[in-house]
């Protein structure tokens, strides 16, 4: 098209996480997906200065079609601020990521004590369970409901019946996965809920119970119903 346009970000969701704490020896990928007309060019700065291949052992890769910078096998000297500068003749935009290279011993995920907490609500109410996870390695987080089948919580193999309600995915941010919302609660929602976090070292989980109470005035309505029939 002939519509000239200064550079703009095409996927800001992929850029929300500015601080990247990455274990030593891992691969880091920073993305700055952009558009513009004419198609903008992209360059990278480290701590405000031109980032050259010779600035790190093994260099780095730039995937222009993916608007990404890739550094393999990061070391402590890779720590710092990385800025993508995207420009064309009509303008320039930039975005900065901070890289911290973690050298401490990676551990299985740590879950904040007391979370998720037991909750109770009335039928039709809303409830939320919160889970705070600390993990050196990127954790995969799931919310699980312990369900019953044919009146039993366990199958013939002795394993519990489980339903995954929510799991961290491509379109789910860390913040979104830390909270489980249950809207317009029914009696069937009562039971045990588990926040499960796993990483390459192991799995940790905490559970909480949801108690569902009758909505106020419900019993009155039921006992009064014969009057309405008359």
């Amino acid at each position: 098209s002939n519509n000239k346009r200064a550079p703009y970000w095409t996927n800001t969701e992929k850029m929300e996480k500015r601080l990247h704490a990455v274990p030593a020896a891992n691969t880091v990928k920073f993305r700055c997906p952009a558009g513009g007309n004419p198609m903008p060019t992209m360059r990278w700065l480290k701590n405000g200065k031109e980032f050259k291949q010779e600035h790190r052992i093994g260099g780095y890769k730039v995937r222009n079609q993916h608007w990404s910078l890739i550094m393999e096998s990061v070391v402590p000297s890779d720590k710092g601020n990385y800025t993508c500068v995207v420009e064309n003749e009509y303008g320039s935009i930039n975005h900065t990521y901070h890289l911290d290279v973690v050298e401490r011993s990676p551990h299985r995920p740590i879950l904040q004590a007391g979370l998720p907490a037991n909750a109770s609500t009335v039928v039709g109410g809303d409830v939320e369970f919160v889970c705070k996870v600390y993990s050196d390695a990127q954790p995969h987080i799931q919310w699980i409901k312990h369900v019953e089948k044919n009146g039993s919580k366990y199958g013939p193999d002795g394993l519990p019946y489980l339903k995954v309600l929510k799991a961290a995915g491509v379109n789910t941010t860390d913040k979104e996965i830390e909270v489980l919302y249950i809207r317009n609660v029914t009696f069937e929602d009562a039971g045990e809920y588990t926040c499960l976090a796993g990483n390459s070292i192991g799995i940790s989980f905490h559970s909480a119970w949801l108690t569902v109470l009758p909505a106020p005035g419900r019993e009155k309505e039921i006992t009064a119903s014969p009057d309405y029939l008359e």
Epitope: P23, A25, N26, T27, S105, P106, H107, R108, I110, L111, Q112, A113, A137, Q138, H140, Q142, I144, L159, P160, L162, V164, T194, L196, G198, N199, S200, I201, G202, I203, S204, F205, H206
Partner: antibody, heavy 124, light 112 residues
Framework: EVQLLESGGGVVQPGRSLRLSCAAS????????MHWVRQAPGKGLEWVAV????????YYADSVKGRFTISRDNSKNTLSLQMNSLRVEDTAIYYC?????????????????WGQGTMVTVSS | DIVMTQTPLSLSVTPGQPASISCRSS???????????VYWYVQKSGQPPQLLIY???NRFSGVPDRFSGSGSRTDFTLKISRVEAEDVGVYYC?????????FGGGTKVEIK
């Protein structure tokens, strides 16, 4: 049946390279972290490296950091250990071990299944 | 790194008699989820290690009930209530809290 089968061991000179493989079967390989553990002749067990279920995270023992690289191919259910700049002290049986899974643990969350091991001898 | 110290180095037991192996960690293995991540293995001659006990006291499937694990935080014990001839091997404790995962030096169990 859940199984891990290592291969690629052999005799090699110091400073040379070797690549170990581990073929997994009987479980959903792509849902589990995987480890390498080694055992020098007549000695105890030493953890070597781990890789996350999707390959995004890798950790190494200090004794092999910078020389060994752990990797995986989930499409082929294969775990690998590329060993460069080998030293005499790397001589050991290398075991492939299943790590933590991706779901609710109904037993141990890993380190339950070990391969038979493959022998690596570094000698001049 | 977490250091796992195992005692004794070796143990000679009469069949039918009890045996006890101790393991001490340099840091607490009690995790935030309330579990204690110490594992116990036996390695029989020419074989890979076999899991006996996980998370301090849980017997792995197929493990005879004469094996039990106990302890708290930094001090752990593997007990065999009545040793049988097939129990010979080297026993290892392992911490599964953080990398590097570390093992005890091993305890060799023999039959008198």
């Amino acid at each position: 049946e859940v199984q891990l089968l290592e291969s690629g061991g052999g005799v090699v000179q110091p400073g040379r390279s070797l690549r170990l493989s581990c073929a997994a079967s009987g479980f959903t390989f792509s849902s589990y972290a995987m480890h390498w553990v080694r055992q020098a002749p007549g000695k105890g067990l030493e953890w070597v490296a781990v890789i996350s279920y999707d390959g995004s995270n890798k950790y190494y023992a200090d004794s092999v950091k910078g020389r060994f690289t752990i990797s995986r191919d989930n499409s082929k259910n294969t775990l690998s250990l590329q060993m460069n700049s080998l030293r005499v002290e790397d001589t050991a049986i290398y075991y492939c071990v299943r790590g933590a899974g991706h779901g609710f643990p109904t037993g141990p969350d890993g380190f339950d299944i070990w391969g038979q091991g493959t022998m690596v001898t570094v000698s001049s | 790194d977490i250091v796992m110290t195992q005692t004794p180095l070796s143990l000679s037991v009469t069949p039918g008699q009890p045996a006890s192996i101790s393991c001490r960690s340099s840091r607490s293995l009690l995790h935030s989820d309330g579990k204690t991540y110490v594992y116990w293995y036996v390695q029989k001659s020419g074989q890979p290690p076999q899991l006996l006990i996980y998370e301090l006291s849980n017997r792995f499937s197929g493990v005879p009930d004469r094996f039990s694990g106990s302890g708290s935080r930094t001090d752990f014990t593997l007990k065999i209530s009545r040793v049988e001839a097939e129990d010979v091997g080297v026993y290892y404790c392992m911490q599964y809290v953080e990398a590097p995962l570390t093992f005890g030096g091993g305890t060799k169990v023999e039959i008198k």
